[in-house]
Amino acid sequence: KESCDVQLYIKRQSEHSILAGDPFELECPVKYCANRPHVTWCKLNGTTCVKLEDRQTSWKEEKNISFFILHFEPVLPNDNGSYRCSANFQSNLIESHSTTLYVTDVKSASERPSKDEMASRPWLLY
């Protein structure tokens, strides 16, 4: 029997490589049974996750799952970093794993560290 707890389907250590200037949708897949929970996005700043206010978000409903989407229109260089979605469900806060956006600034791509260089220097993400 499947759990009726809210579940957030973001993979641990997931990453997205994206270009500055492009549109991008960051999806938080949400599974719930009855009432759709209140979901928010935040961006990690050290060990604190700062709630993203005044950002365009939307819901996309599919048969077995819903997606809470954070819109980047367009992606900016300072969108680089790690994000987490959270759901309020029956007075409980459920947090997803963080997912990391690696933003390449097309204007200075040759000067930027590659994704693999970034991965070998995790302090860049904190």
């Epitope: 957030l8 973001i10 993979k11 641990r12 997931s14 990453e15 997205h16 990690l44 991965a119």
Partner: antibody, heavy 119, light 112 residues
Framework: QVQLQESGPGLVKPSGTLSLTCAVS????????IHWVRQPPGKGLEWIGR????????KYNPSFKSRATISADKSKNQASLKLSSVTAADTAVYYC????????????WGQGTLVTVSS | DIQMTQSPSSLSASVGDRVTITCRSS???????????LNWLQQKPGKAPKRLIY???KLDSGVPSRFSGSGSGTDFTLTISSLQPEDFATYYC?????????FGQGTKLEIK
Amino acid sequence: QVQLQESGPGLVKPSGTLSLTCAVSGFNIKDTYIHWVRQPPGKGLEWIGRNDPANGNTKYNPSFKSRATISADKSKNQASLKLSSVTAADTAVYYCASYEGYYERFGYWGQGTLVTVSS
Amino acid sequence: DIQMTQSPSSLSASVGDRVTITCRSSQSLLDRDGKSYLNWLQQKPGKAPKRLIYLVSKLDSGVPSRFSGSGSGTDFTLTISSLQPEDFATYYCWQDTHFPYTFGQGTKLEIK
């Protein structure tokens, strides 16, 4: 029934490229990370790298980074490993493993395939 | 890279014995979410590894309750409370907190 099945040539010539496929059945690989791990005869396990089939993102062990290419095909529910410029030291049993990415709920391994590098 | 050091490298024991294998990491396996991503695998000769324990102490489905895992930070333990004949195998710890992921060198559990 869950199954991970590695396949590919059992013999590769030195300086050639080792190519293996991991066919998965019983679950959707997009919900997992696909890992490749090898085990030289009589030795321990060594992690080569892993792929996120959902978006293609791949991480490599720096020991293999310049030679290894890991990819996945969501539509075929399979993954592949290519290892170039092989030497006798690359002779090993190669395993693919699939670990659920959200809540660690499962971690399945293929049965492994022995690849010998020899002329 | 994180070094994973298992001890002992080999161990002789009898059916019914209580056995403990330790795994020490060269740095903390605590991830940003406050969890340690430490797995224990069992491998029998000529067979693929099988995950027994994940997240330090969670048993995979179908794994007998005589197996247990504990520890935190850098020190982890696999305990088999009462050895059964089918438990004689090689056991590996594996960390998947930090890249590149790394394995312990293995502990071979043999019949005394």
